[in-house]
């Protein structure tokens, strides 16, 4: 005959454990029911009565099957640099993540404890590693033949436009300015940028070599977080 199903509370067989969604109550020395997520144990079990569960109050939660006497408090409201990506309910805690343009400088078990603004690369410097949810932007100087004239946490250095006749040579913080004859872009079409303050880095203030002698310059790879460098700026 099949073994009879035991109903909680019941005394476990020696050496055996309680079943799924049950716990062993040391005082009653019985296997008793756990409370479902969103509830907590209002009255613990005895040898003759099972656990009495009650719903979590507002702003409290339990995420797992449990026998805790009180529900856990939801975390405080998200700060102004955060967005609430998961609301506080009886079954889950509030989760705050950093809003766009910020990254998590100090994480916690779920969500973020401290957000910080993504570093902005100043003119003459470009993004060499895009920011992520958990890492800051890295800025590096624009290589010869490239420029960035923005203060931005997303802009990479871009190649100077190629002019038939150069009016003003480009530098690290300014695109080349062509005379009225139409330029050939070395990049996707875009507006001609007006002169900006010249970078203090002498290596980038020299006229760019003609294409025939320019070094084969290429890729764009990003890197890990770094402390604020001279190429970065605060908000």
């Amino acid at each position: 005959l099949p073994a009879q199903v035991a109903f909680t509370p019941y005394a476990p067989e020696p050496g055996s454990t309680c079943r799924l969604r049950e716990y062993y109550d040391q005082t009653a020395q019985m296997c008793c029911s756990k409370c479902s997520p969103g509830q907590h144990a209002k009255v613990f079990c005895t040898k003759t009565s099972d656990t009495v569960c009650d719903s979590c109050e507002d702003s409290t939660y339990t995420q797992l099957w449990n026998w805790v006497p009180e529900c856990l408090s939801c975390g405080s409201r998200c700060s102004s640099d955060q967005v609430e990506t998961q609301a506080c309910t009886r079954e889950q805690n509030r989760i705050c993540t950093c809003r766009p343009g910020w990254y998590c400088a100090l994480s916690k078990q779920e969500g973020c404890r401290l957000c910080a603004p993504l570093r902005k690369c100043r003119p003459g410097f470009g993004v060499a590693r895009p920011g992520t949810e958990t890492s800051d932007v890295v800025c590096k100087p624009c290589a010869p033949g490239t420029f960035s004239n923005t203060t931005s946490s997303t802009d990479i250095c871009r190649p100077h436009q190629i002019c038939n006749v150069v009016a003003i040579p480009g530098n690290a913080s300014m695109d080349a300015v062509c005379t009225s004859t139409s330029p050939t872009r070395s990049m996707a079409p875009g507006a001609v940028h007006l002169p900006q303050p010249v970078s203090t880095r002498s290596q980038h203030t020299q006229p760019t070599p003609e294409p025939s002698t320019a070094p084969s310059t290429s890729f764009l790879l990003p890197m890990g977080p770094s402390p604020p460098a001279e190429g970065s700026t605060g908000d």
């Epitope: 190649p159 990049m187 290596q203 890729f219 764009l220 790879l221 990003p222």
Partner: antibody, heavy 118, light 109 residues
Framework: EVQLVQSGAEVKKPGATVKISCKVS????????IHWVQQAPGKGLEWMGR????????EYAPNFQDRVTITADTSTDTAYMELSSLRSEDTAVYYC???????????WGQGTTVTVSS | QAVVTQEPSLTVSPGGTVTLTCRSS?????????ANWVQQKPGQAFRGLIG???DRAPGVPARFSGSLLGGKAALTLSGAQPEDEAEYYC?????????FGGGTKLTVL
């Protein structure tokens, strides 16, 4: 003139470790990342990782992260790539480079041949 | 890690147009992958041609152009020259690392 000069060829036994150097000149080493790329015989390129010489921060390809260590010494303008637990599939030419999909500062070392054989 | 796939080989006639593509195993290629294209000629140094999906590197001839086509990165060579015969590699950025494709051997014939 920008130059990246790598150390010479190496022959190693399986399980050993190899450390290759890459001496840069002609630019400020902290201005650009240094990358390491593998090219096995008859095969394509495999990006291994990179170092920011300014602060030593590194990023590695998932396929290599357990075995590779990339460092940079700004006092000697030299970057290093150490690959451990060598196996025969690691027989390849290894290149250091300033190629960085974000900067157009594109220079490559001459390559270092590593042969792993018992 | 992600796998980046390219055509193993392509052939183009001198003066003709050819498009090389670069597919990501993780989904459509976007501008956040900062697609790069690198050229390797036998016995010569590598040369970066395209960065940031569609920016030609300084000194790269206008016949090379980069774009996104149907969820893939693409390198189009318009008016192929004999000296363009080479191996072409694409590289895609994935949050904190680069992945190269297997390369396309381009023959100008």
């Amino acid at each position: 003139e920008v130059q990246l000069v790598q150390s010479g060829a190496e022959v190693k036994k399986p399980g050993a470790t190899v450390k290759i150097s890459c001496k840069v000149s002609g630019y400020t080493i902290t201005d650009f990342y240094i990358h390491w790329v593998q090219q096995a015989p008859g095969k394509g390129l495999e990006w291994m990782g990179r170092v920011d010489p300014e602060d030593g921060n590194t990023e590695y390809a998932p396929n290599f992260q357990d075995r590779v260590t990339i460092t940079a010494d700004t006092s000697t303008d030299t970057a290093y790539m150490e690959l451990s637990s060598l196996r025969s599939e690691d027989t390849a030419v290894y290149y250091c480079s300033t190629w960085d999909g974000f900067s157009y500062f594109d220079y490559w070392g001459q390559g270092t041949t590593v042969t792993v054989s018992s | 890690q992600a796998v980046v796939t390219q055509e193993p080989s392509l052939t183009v006639s001198p003066g003709g147009t050819v498009t090389l593509t670069c597919r990501s195993s993780t989904g459509p290629v976007t501008t956040n992958n900062y697609a790069n294209w690198v050229q390797q000629k036998p016995g010569q140094a590598f040369r970066g041609l395209i960065g940031g999906t569609n920016d030609r590197a300084p000194g790269v001839p206008a016949r090379f152009s980069g774009s996104l086509l149907g969820g893939k990165a693409a390198l189009t060579l318009s008016g192929a020259q004999p000296e363009d015969e080479a191996e072409y590699y694409c590289a895609l950025w994935y949050r904190n690392h680069w992945v190269f494709g297997g390369g396309t051997k381009l023959t100008v014939l």
